[in-house]
């Protein structure tokens, strides 16, 4: 049995420039205890998009719409999308560690593509 599943239900999302993009993520458990972060890209060069605990992310808001009994919602919305925001976004669960938290499990990723703003 998996201890926890990270569910990114949408493989891809297409958004017009200037609009907001909602990136969905749900988890089946809070255990193991630890934070959830969003990144664009994978590997060493990935970019932190949102960390609830620290940092300033003025274009990102949390979107908790799921009230399902068996899932916890950790979705985000990014406002004023530009072509530079295109890429694959990962919802990542960390496990509390000492001294540093340890990456535990990542979602499969959601690819964000940006359409030209309608004229």
């Amino acid at each position: 049995e998996d201890e926890l599943q990270v569910i990114q239900p949408e493989k891809s999302v297409s958004v017009a420039a200037g609009e907001s993009a909602t990136l969905r993520c749900a988890m089946t458990s809070l255990i193991p205890v630890g934070p959830i972060m969003w990144f664009r890209g994978a590997g060493a060069g990935r970019e932190l998009i949102y960390n609830q605990k620290e940092g300033h992310f003025p274009r990102v808001t949390t979107v908790s719409e799921l009230t399902k009994r068996n899932n916890l919602d950790f979705s985000i919305s990014i406002s004023n999308i530009t072509p530079a925001d295109a890429g694959t976004y990962y919802c990542v669960k960390f496990r509390k560690g000492s001294p540093d938290d340890v990456e535990f499990k990542s979602g499969a990723g959601t690819e964000l593509s940006v359409r030209a703003k309608p004229s």
Partner: antibody
Framework: EVQLVESGGGLVKPGGSLRLSCAAS????????MSWVRQTPGKGLEWVAT????????YYPNSVKGRFTLSRDNAKNSLYLQMNSLRAEDTAVYYC???????????WGQGTTVTVSS | DIVITQSPASLAVSLGERATISCRAS??????????MHWYQQKPGQPPKLLIY???NLESGVPDRFSGSGSRTDFTLTINPLQAEDVATYYC??????????FGGGTKVEIK
């Protein structure tokens, strides 16, 4: 119907040990986070221990850390709390609790009483 | 530790009237818009029973006269209208990322 049946409580002297058991039925035990919560007249409800669905991760408050050990046997649908170096302040009713997401305490057993006294 | 202050300690309400119980956490229990505060009912001689999970979600089988609201540090359980079978002690509980998980001190609800 979810059922959680605790056993193993009793009277023990300070410094002694007890092992509490919880037999679970009526749900997919191996998919649930499991916990123990205790209740004393003086301190109300207190979280004691939590274990992940697969048994890999355990959590304790400082009041019991190093003295209590939580384990589970998913093949037997059973949860265990080994309590060592017991103190008078551990006297309480101990409830076995299941949790679908590890967030709220969803279902509670009827409890088993632990009394630590000389 | 996150300390939860629950008030009042006891409450007497007339049948059919509204009962309101408050819990205040010493720091936010929210994460990504989820409020990890829950409410339980305990009747004498029985274990606690989950009523409301994540601040405002009614547990299956719980009558809709029970409702929960709030976010971050301030939460409320409302029983409206109060019925005789609602006489019990009510507890709030936070399960935020910050351990240990803690409970409020309880509110005993009686009929006036």
């Amino acid at each position: 119907e979810v059922q959680l049946v605790e056993s193993g409580g009793g009277l023990v002297k300070p410094g002694g040990s007890l092992r509490l058991s919880c037999a679970a039925s009526g749900f997919t035990f191996s998919s649930y986070v499991m916990s123990w919560v205790r209740q004393t007249p003086g301190k109300g409800l207190e979280w004691v221990a939590t274990i992940s669905s697969g048994g890999t991760y355990t959590y304790y408050p400082n009041s019991v850390k190093g003295r209590f050990t939580l384990s589970r046997d998913n093949a037997k649908n059973s949860l265990y709390l080994q309590m060592n170096s017991l103190r008078a302040e551990d006297t309480a009713v101990y409830y076995c609790v299941s949790s679908m997401t590890g967030s709220s305490f969803d279902y509670w057993g009827q409890g088993t009483t632990v009394t630590v006294s000389s | 530790d996150i300390v939860i202050t629950q008030s009042p300690a006891s409450l007497a309400v007339s049948l059919g009237e509204r009962a309101t119980i408050s819990c205040r956490a010493s720091e936010s229990v929210d994460s990504y818009g989820n409020s990890f505060m829950h409410w339980y009912q305990q009747k004498p001689g029985q274990p606690p029973k989950l009523l409301i999970y994540r601040a405002s979600n009614l547990e299956s089988g719980v009558p809709d006269r029970f409702s929960g609201s709030g976010s971050r540090t301030d939460f409320t359980l409302t029983i409206n209208p109060l019925q005789a079978e609602d006489v019990a002690t009510y507890y709030c509980h936070q399960s935020s990322e910050q351990l240990p998980w803690t409970f409020g001190g309880g509110t005993k609800v009686e009929i006036k």
